[in-house]
């Protein structure tokens, strides 16, 4: 006759890792006499013998979960009792491993520029999947505007036109990767005036052209108002290019007036409107130029792409409604006018204008634009474009060229900092350094106004003849 023996668990339960929909087994080998009664609990709740999700075999020593679900994770315990001594218990954890699954995929979104867009991407998986996003064919990079939230959703602050496109989210863990469907983010843009009409002071009987440029998606329409009423006289010319509408109102001036340009476009059932006004007066006036603030961003235009340093951060002036488009429009206009100047002058003038309109940003306390160094401005003025500049000054203009009625100013060299005083205060024009080294003959130019601010440094040893008032070194 066997002696009674209290139960002893000879194989304690261990942590079991299991994939969803796979089988998971806990073994609880018990030695005892008489044979024990073995019960199982999950998270301290008894597992019922008749629960069809489980199979309990080998006299209760084997617990099998027939098809693991993500909700099965927890602590499983076997309790053995045969009436001899106390009941014994052994516990182990079930860790449900799960390939990534996108439970709430992103959906197509239409959003108005400047607002916040959130594309959802809720995921499941163990280990917890990391979520990244793809735009078009490229991995999306986070920045100050674009962030992947803890939830996996993509948040875009201050949505821009360039954010439009196809997106998908990617959930990834050690067991695999899941991709959402491609969804489309469409950016609608309120009508906005890029270039407001400029006020004019003219003599009686002059012709004046007021120009108003607007942008929007869809392309806006432009109408003109004169002193609160529809324009009664004058001719209007319009052109549309790349979602930009350009409207020009030509007037014969016999009385002063307030002229308003109204740009309108439609979003669903709603309309958006932008207005800008200009006065035409018959009296003397002076245009005051205020320094305005702006922001630094990579140059994404085309005109100055070859002139500005690759990926350079340049300054965009927020006195314009849409600084990037407005400044590009200005340089585009200037570029066409430069076709008339000499081959010697043109590339130097292009370098000057691009670096003047798209000033290099420097950091420090706040990122701010750096003007061109005076020495380089003078090199363009007195060397590369001496003839053109003299002709221009003879006509009492302050621009390199005329663009219809609009004069685009070039920098006034005397009002620019010298790199000899503070080399970090201004931008050099690498093109001019290159030409200095590579051009063999230049006319000798003598500065008409030597500046006390620029030391008399010796001219370069090459035959690049520099005014004694400044040096290109």
């Amino acid at each position: 006759e066997k002696l009674p023996k209290a139960p002893v668990i000879t194989t304690p339960l261990e942590t079991v890792d299991a994939l969803v929909e796979e089988v998971a087994t806990f073994m609880c080998a018990v030695e005892s006499y008489p044979q024990p009664e073995i019960s199982w609990t999950r998270n301290k709740i008894l597992i019922k013998l008749f629960d069809t999700r489980y199979s309990i075999r080998e006299n209760g020593q084997l617990l099998t979960i027939l098809s693991v679900e993500d909700s099965d994770d927890g602590i499983y315990c076997c309790i053995a009792n045969n009436g001899v001594g106390g009941a014994v218990e052994s516990c182990g954890a079930l860790q449900v491993k799960m390939k990534p699954k996108i439970t709430r995929p992103p959906i197509n979104v239409k959003i108005i520029e400047g607002l916040k867009a959130v594309l959802p991407c809720t995921t499941m998986g163990n280990p917890k999947p990391s979520v990244s996003w793809i735009k078009g064919d490229n991995a999306l990079r986070e920045n100050s505007r674009i962030a992947v939230l803890e939830s996996g959703s993509l948040r875009i602050h201050n949505v821009q036109k360039e954010d439009a496109g196809q997106y998908r989210c990617v959930a990834k863990n050690s067991l695999g990767t899941a991709y959402s469907k491609l969804v489309k983010l469409e950016v609608e843009v309120f009508a906005r005036i890029l270039r407001a009409p400029e006020s004019h002071n003219v003599t009686f009987g002059s012709f004046v052209t007021l120009r108003c440029t607007a942008i929007g998606i869809p392309v806006p329409t432009i109408s003109w108002i004169e002193n609160g009423n529809a324009v009664s006289s004058g001719s209007i010319q319009e052109s549309v290019k790349d979602r930009v509408i350009d409207s020009r109102l030509q007037l014969f001036i016999t009385k002063p007036g307030l002229y308003t340009c109204i740009a309108t476009n439609k979003h669903g059932e709603k309309f958006s409107t932008a207005k800008a006004a200009a006065t035409v007066s018959i009296a003397e006036w002076s245009k005051s130029q205020k320094d305005s603030q702006g922001y630094c961003a990579q140059y994404r235009g085309e005109v100055c792409d070859a002139v500005l340093a690759k990926d350079a951060l340049v300054f965009f002036n927020t006195s314009y409604r849409d600084p990037e488009d407005a400044q590009e429009l200005l340089i585009h206009t200037a570029w066409n006018e430069l076709k008339a100047v000499s081959p010697l002058c043109r590339p130097a003038a292009e370098a000057l204008l691009c670096n003047h309109l798209f000033q290099e940003c420097s950091p420090g306390v706040v990122p701010t634009p750096m003007p061109i160094c005076r020495e380089y401005c003078l090199a363009v003025k007195e060397l590369f474009c001496a003839k053109e500049w003299q002709a221009m000054e003879g006509k009492a203009h302050r621009g390199l060229y005329r663009s219809g009625m609009h004069l685009l100013p070039v920098p006034e060299c005397s009002k620019l900092p010298s790199m000899h005083r503070d080399p970090t205060a201004c931008t050099r024009l690498p093109y001019l350094d290159y030409k200095k080294e590579n051009i063999t003959t230049f006319p000798s130019i003598t500065s008409s106004r030597p500046s006390a601010d620029i030391p008399n440094l010796p001219a370069s040893t090459s035959s690049f003849a520099v005014s004694p008032a400044y040096s290109m070194t």
């Epitope: 940003c361 306390v365 503070d422």
Partner: antibody, heavy 115, light 113 residues
Framework: EVQLVESGGGLVQPGGSLSLSCVAS????????MNWVRQAPGKGLEWLSV???????YYADSVKGRFTISRDNVKNTLYLQLNNLKPEDTALYYC?????????WGQGTQVTVSS | EIVLTQSPSSVTASIGEKVTINCESS??????????LNWYQQRPGQSPRLLIY?????QSGVPDRFSGSGSGSTTDFTLTISSFQPEDVAVYYC?????????FGPGTKVELK
């Protein structure tokens, strides 16, 4: 040649005020950023404030609310108004020309805060 | 704020010897393709003097035995005196101009052996 000449330093009691000046010559003053930097006896350099070409000013946290930088482009002069002075403000105060590098330094003016 | 750490804190050099001073930044000072890290020399009893700006550009009038290195998104910068001279006895400071407040390293004292 660029010259920066500071003045206005002296002995002052804690809680007192002082006005430092820096007269600039040899360059077009209005076109450049100007700074104040100080150096406590036997210690390193500490940047205090900068004023840009539009007279917009920025300060180090240690002096914000107590010191005020200003410029007079007609007189070619940079100023630093020091209020509510503390013993730890005792230092040689330099006027410095420069935007992202401190290019030209004056000889400094001594400020001593002591009771 | 950006913290700059200089090493060594002091060094003794013989005439003609190569001297290397290191400056480590707590974060990148790279902006718009330039490293906004400057080096200054302060001789005993004198005002500081700019030696190097943008990490490696020598200020005009500075002898070519002084050179600065550190490029890309590095946080480690070096000032090298290729052949130490008696007039190079000074304290050398690095300084960042990447963001506010502008900050200096604690300085490296270079003495004549």
């Amino acid at each position: 040649e660029v010259q920066l000449v500071e003045s206005g330093g002296g002995l002052v009691q804690p809680g007192g005020s002082l006005s430092l000046s820096c007269v600039a010559s040899g360059f077009t003053f209005s076109l450049y950023y100007m700074n104040w930097v100080r150096q406590a006896p036997g210690k390193g350099l500490e940047w205090l404030s900068v004023i840009d070409t539009h007279s917009i000013a920025y300060y180090a946290d240690s002096v914000k609310g107590r010191f005020t930088i200003s410029r007079d482009n007609v007189k070619n002069t940079l100023y630093l108004q020091l209020n509510n002075l503390k013993p730890e403000d005792t230092a040689l105060y330099y006027c410095v020309l420069g935007r992202t590098a401190l290019v030209r330094w004056g000889q400094g003016t001594q400020v001593t805060v002591s009771s | 704020e950006i913290v700059l750490t200089q090493s060594p804190s002091s060094v003794t050099a013989s005439i003609g010897e190569k001297v290397t001073i290191n400056c480590e930044s707590s974060q990148s000072v790279l902006y718009n393709q330039k490293n906004y890290l400057n080096w200054y020399q302060q001789r005993p009893g004198q005002s500081p003097r700019l030696l190097i700006y943008w990490a490696s550009t020598r200020q005009s009038g500075v002898p070519d035995r002084f050179s600065g290195s550190g490029s890309g998104s590095t946080t480690d910068f070096t000032l090298t005196i290729s052949s130490f001279q008696p007039e190079d006895v000074a304290v050398y400071y690095c300084q960042q101009a990447y963001n506010a407040p502008l900050t200096f390293g604690p300085g490296t004292k270079v003495e004549l052996k």
